[in-house]
């Protein structure tokens, strides 16, 4: 249940897909991975605001419980509906690989 | 991948399963559910420092942007990694249904 | 824009060695790999074999392994490839391209380079 | 190796004509595969990669499809600039392999 897609906070405020671009250093990844040197990471950044993207009825009742009790229960928050793959080239003990990660990447975003 | 399950925020601090108490009044669902009047709602509360139940590469990502981009990228999220099932008992058009919902109650909980 | 830019043509007895280099530009040459891919006479496209510039990583296709050398020169932002011992099947364009990116795209060319094996 | 079968090895067309190009590998390859158009004399260029992604600039009659090991590129109306040779590219895994190639010919 993919609910409103109409931010009331304004245009690109709530929870929506982002790409930040993060070399290998940034990530941790220098000593493992060979290419690409930098990624172009889509990641799911903003606010989630009454029944904006709501997930499912858990992220319905997290509404309702985080508008009656704000310091017990939190908003739900903006994370990854699904993944899009992505492909690494890597050092391994035989030598270099073509790796693919599924869970790497985000593809579209919800709140949860 | 789980990552770590030691919280260094100290005991209680970091992403687990909560329990609150909520009405029908409370989620908005006294028109149409007629039982339970009260719910003994599961959800996923708490920080998510570096690693902390890390549910997959992109969570890991998302600590490594953090750190160095944290007005940018958000920490990681304390989400349901899946759910209980719950069943309602509600008004219909024709009387009163014994109705299951599967994503309603968190089971246990990751970060994201 | 990027760019990859390839030596000229060259004759080559049979026997000789050919260097082809590909120069890069309007991107970072560190941040992704180089292919070079071979394409005999009216034949299909043949992979030879990739190189990290950042490293000097390489993975050659096991027909080539032991007569073709991949190097690149990051002063430069040039890729090189050497073949050695050749002969006339290797009569072929040469190219370079960038790739894979993180979606195994291949997806920069250069503009080939003739090397014609004949005695 | 992965072995990348490509049919039609060739086809006739006209002007308007919808075609579509399979590719076959020989073993899973996610979707991982590339489609390239090379006209004589010319590098080849990329049209599809990650299966279905359209590359920047290339018209949008041009789509992919498949996972795993079937693929197809489909020029949904065929124009004079699309006669040419196309082929597929898997890059799931090194050695990087191509399919033999479809030439799109004037009917």
């Known amino acids: 249940a993919r609910n409103g897609d109409h931010c009331p906070l304004g245009p690109g405020r709530c929870c929506r897909l982002h790409t930040v671009r993060a070399s290998l250093e940034d990530l941790g990844w220098a000593d493992w991975v060979l290419s690409p040197r930098e990624v172009q990471v889509t990641m799911c950044i903003g606010a989630c605001p009454s029944q904006f993207r709501a997930a499912n009825m858990h992220a319905q009742i997290k509404t309702s419980l985080h508008r009656l009790k704000p310091d017990t229960v939190p908003a739900p928050c903006c994370v990854p509906a699904s993944y899009n793959p992505m492909v690494l080239i890597q050092k391994t003990d035989t030598g270099v690989s073509l790796q693919t990660y599924d869970d790497l990447l985000a593809k579209d975003c919800h709140c949860i | 991948a789980r990552n770590g399950d030691h919280c260094p925020l100290g005991p209680g601090r970091c992403c687990r399963l909560h329990t609150v108490r909520a009405s029908l009044e409370d989620l908005g669902w006294a028109d149409w559910v007629l039982s339970p009047r009260e719910v003994q709602v599961t959800m996923c509360i708490g920080a998510c420092p570096s690693q902390f139940r890390a549910a997959n590469m992109h969570a890991q990502i998302k600590t490594s942007l953090h750190r160095l981009k944290p007005d940018t990228v958000p920490a990681p999220c304390c989400v349901p990694a899946s759910y209980n099932p719950m069943v309602l008992i509600q008004k219909t058009d024709t009387g009163v249904s014994l109705q299951t919902y599967d994503d309603l109650l968190a089971k246990d909980c990751h970060c994201i | 824009q990027v760019q990859l830019v390839q030596s000229g043509a060259e004759v080559k007895k049979p026997g000789a060695s050919v260097k082809v280099s590909c120069k890069a530009s309007?991107?970072?040459?560190?941040?992704?790999?180089i292919n070079w891919v071979r394409q005999a006479p009216g034949q299909g496209l043949e992979w030879m074999g990739w190189i990290t510039a950042y490293s000097g990583d390489t993975v050659y296709a096991q027909k080539l392994q032991g007569r073709v050398t991949m190097t690149t020169d990051t002063s430069t932002s040039t890729a090189y490839m050497e073949l050695r011992s050749l002969r006339s099947d290797d009569t072929a364009v040469y190219y370079c391209a960038r790739g894979p990116g993180q979606y195994a795209d291949v997806d920069v060319w250069g503009q080939g380079t003739m090397v014609t094996v004949s005695s | 190796d992965i072995q990348m079968t490509q049919s039609p090895s060739s086809v006739s067309a006209s002007v308007g004509d919808r075609v579509t190009i399979t590719c076959r590998a020989s073993?899973?390859?996610?979707?991982?595969l590339a489609w390239y158009q090379q006209k004589p004399g010319k590098a080849p260029k990329l049209l599809i990669y990650a299966a279905s992604s359209l590359q920047s600039g290339v018209p949008s009659r041009f789509s992919g499809s498949g996972s795993g090991t079937d693929f197809t590129l489909t020029i949904s109306s065929l124009q004079p600039e699309d006669f040419a040779t196309y082929y597929c590219q898997q890059a799931n895994s090194f050695p990087i392999t191509f399919g033999g190639g479809t030439k799109v010919e004037i009917k």
């Open positions: 073993q899973g390859i996610s979707s991982w």
């Open positions: 309007g991107y970072t040459f560190t941040d992704e790999g």
